[in-house]
Interface confidence: low
């Protein structure tokens, strides 16, 4: 398995944005093609999305177990691009794919959001604060 | 070494109670699922419910609801089924098995606690 | 609850042959959107609790030797072991872990 490239978790604010030229930005990580932003800040569901968004990446995704085991490996828990609009909707992506995998807690109406942690996904509430990461595609 | 220590036999009269412990190794519950499972003398395997350590959130198979209650306490890493009522048909041995949320099969199993109900 | 389905109850081999064990769910565990089948197979030796052999039909655990080989999808599925050894003397559980948990009722493995 490739590793990280870099592995100096600091705490300094990352504000550069993940860019298309074949590399990643400074003290983002890359693994298999992607960059991963590692975020220190708490926030909600939606404004994670949205702060993914204004560094040219999505809130955090897992397409394969490979990548989940990476990156739980890695990684402090945080919210992951994966939603319901109910505990009676499937569970979706956030570009509008079915997600790939069950996920714990599922059955409680109020947690409508994912979270990836140690050997796990769960659900949340989409309105309390968790870190978050980001992942751009090279 | 990841592993799974139960509790021993246990001998007990028919209307009586028992609680049976699941002790983990090498790894937090808080991670997992944990499980409980039965065997009767020369039967199969049948699943009676499960845990979220974490939260203490349970799901139990029908055929089990109201005989067997499962508990967790995380500050010592074990997981319990307390059996209520019992009669001969609970004698059998009860098994204890970790999933993980992603894989959900059963990766780790404890060496079973053998149930003898019996006046 | 989905039924899970296990035939011969039991069989009798001997050391060096081949075996294959059936197993079907009474509905699909193919979850589409992964494409992924839950099923996983456990071998029980006398006295001993289920140890995992084969999880997603197909994926043989960690250690396991490559003479047991689980394939199928969908509702059915085979459990195949070449070349039988004299440890491999067991009751072998299908469980199918899509929807809550149910196991097989077993196929026990005699040795001749």
């Known amino acids: 398995i490739p590793f990280l490239e870099q592995n100096n978790f600091s705490p300094n604010t990352r504000t550069q944005k993940a860019r298309h030229c074949g590399h990643c930005p400074e003290e983002w990580i890359t693994y298999s093609n992607s960059c991963y932003y590692i975020g220190k800040e708490r926030r909600t569901w939606e404004e994670s999305l949205l702060a993914c968004t204004s560094k040219n990446s999505s809130l955090l995704s897992i397409d394969n177990e490979e990548e989940m085991k990476f990156l739980a490996s890695i990684l402090p828990s945080s919210w992951i691009g994966v939603f319901r609009n109910s505990s009676h909707h499937p569970w979706v992506t956030i570009n509008g794919l079915a997600f790939k995998h069950k996920i714990k807690d599922s059955d409680n109406a109020e947690l409508n959001c994912a979270v990836l942690q140690v050997n796990r996904l769960k659900s949340a509430q989409c309105g309390s604060s968790m870190i978050y990461h980001c992942k751009h595609k090279l | 070494e990841v592993q799974l220590q139960q509790s021993g036999a246990e001998l007990v009269k028919p209307g009586a109670s028992v609680t049976l412990s699941c002790t983990a190794s090498g790894f937090n519950i808080k991670d997992t699922y944990m499980h409980w499972v039965q065997q009767r003398p020369e039967q199969g395997l049948e699943w009676i419910g499960r845990i979220d350590p974490e939260n203490g959130y349970t799901k139990y198979d029908p055929n089990f609801q109201g005989k067997a209650t499962i508990t967790a306490d995380t500050s010592s890493n074990t997981a319990y089924l307390q059996l209520s009522s019992l009669t001969s048909e609970d004698t059998a041995v009860y098994h204890c098995a970790r999933s993980r949320t992603l894989f959900w099969y059963f990766d780790v199993w404890g060496a079973g606690t053998t149930v003898t109900v019996s006046s | 609850n989905i039924m899970m389905t296990q035939s011969p109850s039991s069989l009798a081999v001997s050391a060096g042959e081949k075996v294959t064990m059936s197993c079907k769910s009474s509905q699909s565990v193919l979850y589409s959107s992964n494409q992924k089948n839950y099923l996983a197979w456990y071998q029980q030796k006398p006295g001993q609790s289920p140890k995992l052999l084969i999880y997603?039909?197909?994926t043989r655990e960690s250690g396991v030797p490559d003479r047991f080989t689980g394939s199928g999808s969908g509702t059915d599925f085979t459990l195949t072991i070449t070349n039988i050894q004299a440890e491999d003397l067991a009751v072998y559980y299908c469980?199918?872990?899509?929807?809550?948990?149910?196991f097989g009722g077993g196929t026990k493995l005699e040795i001749k």
């Open positions: 469980h199918q872990y899509l929807s809550s948990y149910t």
């Open positions: 997603w039909a197909s």
